[in-house]
């Protein structure tokens, strides 16, 4: 009785059960009865990261210096080439197919995360106590100054784009 | 590259034995089914019997069943058919070839084997 | 067993003719387990096409295969001088025995 279902890295084939090909390897011939499957490791510029029956095996991913990418992990047979991006960009997508450059926070917001190669910069709102005055893709929200610290007064708010102006304290009290 | 070298072949007496060799090189011939196939002069092919890669599983063509048998050692890459009880009937060039899903895809060059008294 | 048969025994032909082998099955070749091999005076025989209709690596695309079942045909487009030769079908899906058909020559006319 011919088999409808197969072990696990085999797969049916014409009523046979074959072992599929390991990661690294591509399909040439399905087995038979005599014979095992014959299988050929993938060229140096390719891959495959399953067992399987394919008969071609996937190009490496190309990082192109055009789109700001560059290699991050060499692949091997077996895994593809992982892209980055170039100091200053990010990736537009989980497959990084391609960089754009990293955002700058506004004034009245700081960065809460620094951009990697993958992931653009996290601003956040300065909140009461802090501002920023620049746009940067580097600076936190920095405190308001302690006038009385310095033994000085505030003699202007700070807002969350700007830091307080202290000055003296009034002497005719 | 990938070949396959016969030898063994020569002239018998009917009734005596002869055992024929096949050399493999190139590929992993411990994961390959082998077959023999002979033609005698001036016919066509005939299938004499087939080993699985591990020469567990054997099969022989009526002809020759039972006084022929098929082995192989994979230690050595060498496919061997030894011929007993022989016929003038068996004078033939005999083959070895490589069995895949493909049919067979590589064949030696042949080995002549005469059964005359 | 499977018996194949070909037909004509013998074809004659002129360079740059088309050449139509037959092969008939005395039953259904499984999963068109059928191959085509050409062989040339006192040289082994050669797998040109197997499946019925794929072609082996490294043989020009003027010898093709068709058919399934109990009916195949190698056709090749156009007759090269070294393609004067013996072809043989083969059946390799019932066995034992692997069957060969009796073989077709191409000669030159």
């Known amino acids: 009785e011919p088999p409808t279902a197969c072990r696990e890295k085999q797969y049916l084939i014409n009523s046979q059960c074959c072992s599929l090909c390991q990661p690294g390897q591509k399909l040439v011939s399905d087995c038979t009865e005599f014979t095992e499957t014959e299988c050929l490791p993938c060229s140096e510029s390719e891959f495959l990261d399953t067992w399987n029956r394919e008969t071609r095996c996937h190009q490496h991913k190309y990082c192109d210096p055009n789109l700001g990418l560059q290699v991050q992990q060499k692949g091997t047979s077996e895994t593809d080439t992982i892209c980055t991006c170039e100091e200053g960009l990010h990736c537009t997508s989980e497959s990084c197919e391609s960089c754009v450059p990293h955002r700058s926070c506004l004034p009245g917001f700081g960065v809460k995360q620094i951009a990697t190669g993958v992931s653009d910069t996290i601003c956040e709102p300065c909140p009461v106590g802090f501002f920023s005055n620049v746009s940067s893709a580097f600076e936190k929200c920095r405190p308001w100054t302690s006038c009385e610290t310095k033994d000085l007064v505030v003699q202007q708010a700070g807002t969350n784009k700007t830091d307080v102006v202290c000055g003296p304290q009034d002497r005719q009290r | 590259q990938v070949q396959l070298v016969e030898s063994g072949g020569g002239v018998v007496q009917p009734g005596r034995s002869l055992r024929l060799s096949c050399a493999a090189s190139?590929?992993?011939?411990?994961?390959?089914?082998m077959h023999w196939v002979r033609q005698a002069p001036g016919k066509g092919l005939e299938w004499v019997a087939v080993?699985?890669?591990?020469?567990?599983?054997?099969y022989y063509a009526d002809s020759v069943k039972g006084r022929f048998t098929i082995s192989r050692d994979n230690s050595k890459n060498t496919l061997y058919l030894q011929m007993n009880s022989l016929r003038a009937e068996d004078t033939a060039v005999y083959y070895c070839?490589?069995?895949?899903?493909?049919?067979?895809?590589?064949w030696g060059q042949g080995t002549m084997v005469t059964v005359s008294s | 067993e499977i018996v194949l048969t070909q037909s004509p025994g013998t074809l004659s032909l002129s360079p740059g003719e088309r050449a139509t082998l037959s092969c008939q099955a005395s039953?259904?070749?499984?999963?068109?387990?059928l191959a085509w091999y050409q062989q040339k005076p006192g040289q082994a025989p050669r797998l040109l096409i197997y499946?019925?209709?794929s072609r082996n690596n490294g043989i020009p695309d003027r010898f093709s295969g068709s058919g399934s079942g109990t009916d195949f045909t190698l056709t090749i487009s156009r007759l090269e001088p070294e393609d004067f030769a013996v072809y043989y079908c083969?059946?390799?899906?019932?066995?034992?025995?692997?069957?060969f058909g009796g073989g077709t020559k191409v000669e030159i006319k």
């Open positions: 039953q259904s070749v499984s999963y068109n387990y």
């Open positions: 190139g590929f992993t011939f411990e994961k390959y089914g």
């Open positions: 070839a490589r069995d895949t899903s493909r049919g067979h895809d590589i």
């Open positions: 499946g019925a209709s």
């Open positions: 083969q059946q390799y899906s019932d066995y034992p025995p692997f069957t």
């Open positions: 080993i699985s890669y591990e020469g567990t599983s054997k």
